[in-house]
């Protein structure tokens, strides 16, 4: 594709280039023949994030603590607010406009990946040497007690929910 | 004073193509977008393309894309039209027109004749 | 595409009188509408840009106001060599538009 009559940063309006208005500031007035394109910073709590033409700087995201929001990094004139989720919540999207409370792994389940700000929870079946008897955000699935390296005996053989059971192995007499 | 003088009066047959320059004169050519239109006799004006002659960016009514070809040189500040693949539809006068705040000045026009 | 309506067609006056031509665009073209005057065998001039402002040499009978959608060329009082075909134009959006024209008669 061949450029375009007006360069790069600049629009075309009324038969001529203008120059666009940087981030953080919208469009006051087109460039005439015998005048600049006129820009105005954004105001307070709003942004523009590229270099534009806008009449109207966009409003700054609100983060909103009743549905689990808080600020993440704080807008400037260029930038827009970036919500995340209070501890032990995440994102339900990735433009985050909401959230919901980490989900727990069940009994027989361990902990893959523990949940982020944007992420919830991955969990995995324990499995065959290992456990999980608690339904949990954190815990990975535990191994087995090893009974022999405390000189005792399996009793009652382990599952993906409990742990084995060790005995004092039985003396010959 | 600023003027844009076309070439004169071309007859062509339908398939053919067609160039049509437009000298400019009485400012600086690179400083102003180059604007090319049409009127086919008793009908209203259409826009074809326009062209940026500092550097030779382009844009191109839909219509005439792939057909129309806009080029400058800065060296004699000669602005072309070409126009490919003519029918007798294009039959019309076709002026060139300095930019800046609308087409602030034109050509005299010249007449292009498609027939065979 | 921006289409341009301009009325009337045509129109009859006598020198003197007060002209009016308007121009409706199909959607808001902010103001970027441009006038032009159109005689035979001779070269289309800019009378007005930009709604209002008008081009060098241009003499101050000629006027232009209007915003949005709709724009009016208004002749205070029309003088002989006024007599041609007024065109209106958008400059605001890509295709560039024209009115078809309203050619200006002596009554």
């Known amino acids: 594709e061949p450029p375009t009559a007006c360069r790069e940063k600049q629009y075309l309006i009324n038969s001529q280039c203008c120059s666009l208005c940087q981030p953080g500031q919208k469009l006051v007035s087109d460039c005439t023949e015998f005048t600049e394109t006129e820009c105005l910073p954004c105001g307070e709590s709003e942004f523009l994030d590229t270099w534009n033409r806008e009449t109207h700087c966009h409003q700054h995201k609100y983060c909103d603590p009743n549905l689990g929001l808080r600020v993440q990094q704080k807008g400037t004139s260029e930038t827009d607010t970036i919500c995340t989720c209070e501890e032990g919540w995440h994102c339900t999207s990735e433009a985050c406009e909401s959230c919901v409370l980490h989900r727990s792994c069940s009994p027989g389940f361990g902990v893959k990946q523990i949940a982020t700000g944007v992420s919830d929870t991955i969990c995995e079946p324990c499995p065959v040497g290992f456990f999980s008897n608690v339904s949990s955000a954190f815990e990975k699935c535990h191994p087995w007690t090893s009974c022999e390296t405390k000189d005792l005996v399996v009793q009652q053989a382990g599952t993906n929910k409990t742990d084995v059971v060790c005995g004092p192995q039985d003396r010959l007499r | 004073q600023v003027q844009l003088v076309q070439s004169g009066a071309e007859v062509k047959k339908p398939g053919s193509s067609v160039k049509v320059s437009c000298k400019a004169s009485?400012?600086?050519?690179?400083?102003?977008?180059i604007e090319w239109v049409r009127q086919a006799p008793g009908q209203g004006l259409e826009w074809i393309g326009v062209?940026?002659?500092?550097?030779?960016?382009?844009n191109y009514n839909e219509k005439f894309k792939g057909r129309a070809t806009l080029t400058a040189d800065k060296s004699t500040s000669t602005a072309y039209m070409e126009l490919s693949s003519l029918r007798s539809e294009d039959t019309a006068v076709y002026f060139c027109?300095?930019?800046?705040?609308?087409?602030?000045?034109w050509g005299q026009g010249t007449l292009v004749t498609v027939s065979s | 595409d921006i289409q341009m309506t301009q009325s009337p067609s045509s129109l009859s006056a006598s020198v003197g009188d007060r002209v009016t031509i308007t121009c409706r665009a199909s959607q808001d073209i902010s103001n970027h509408l441009n006038w032009y005057q159109q005689k035979p065998g001779k070269a289309v001039k800019l009378l007005i840009s930009s709604t209002s402002r008008l081009h060098s040499g241009v003499p101050s009978r000629f006027s232009g106001s209007g915003s949005g959608t709709d724009y009016t060329l208004t002749i205070s009082s029309l003088q002989p060599e006024d007599f041609a075909t007024y065109f209106c134009?958008?400059?605001?959006?890509?295709?560039?538009?024209f009115g078809q024209g309203t050619k200006v008669e002596i009554k």
């Open positions: 009485g400012y600086g050519f690179t400083n102003y977008l």
């Open positions: 134009q958008q400059g605001n959006t890509l295709p560039w538009t």
């Open positions: 027109a300095r930019g800046g705040s609308g087409f602030a000045f």
């Open positions: 062209i940026n002659p500092g550097y030779g960016g382009v």
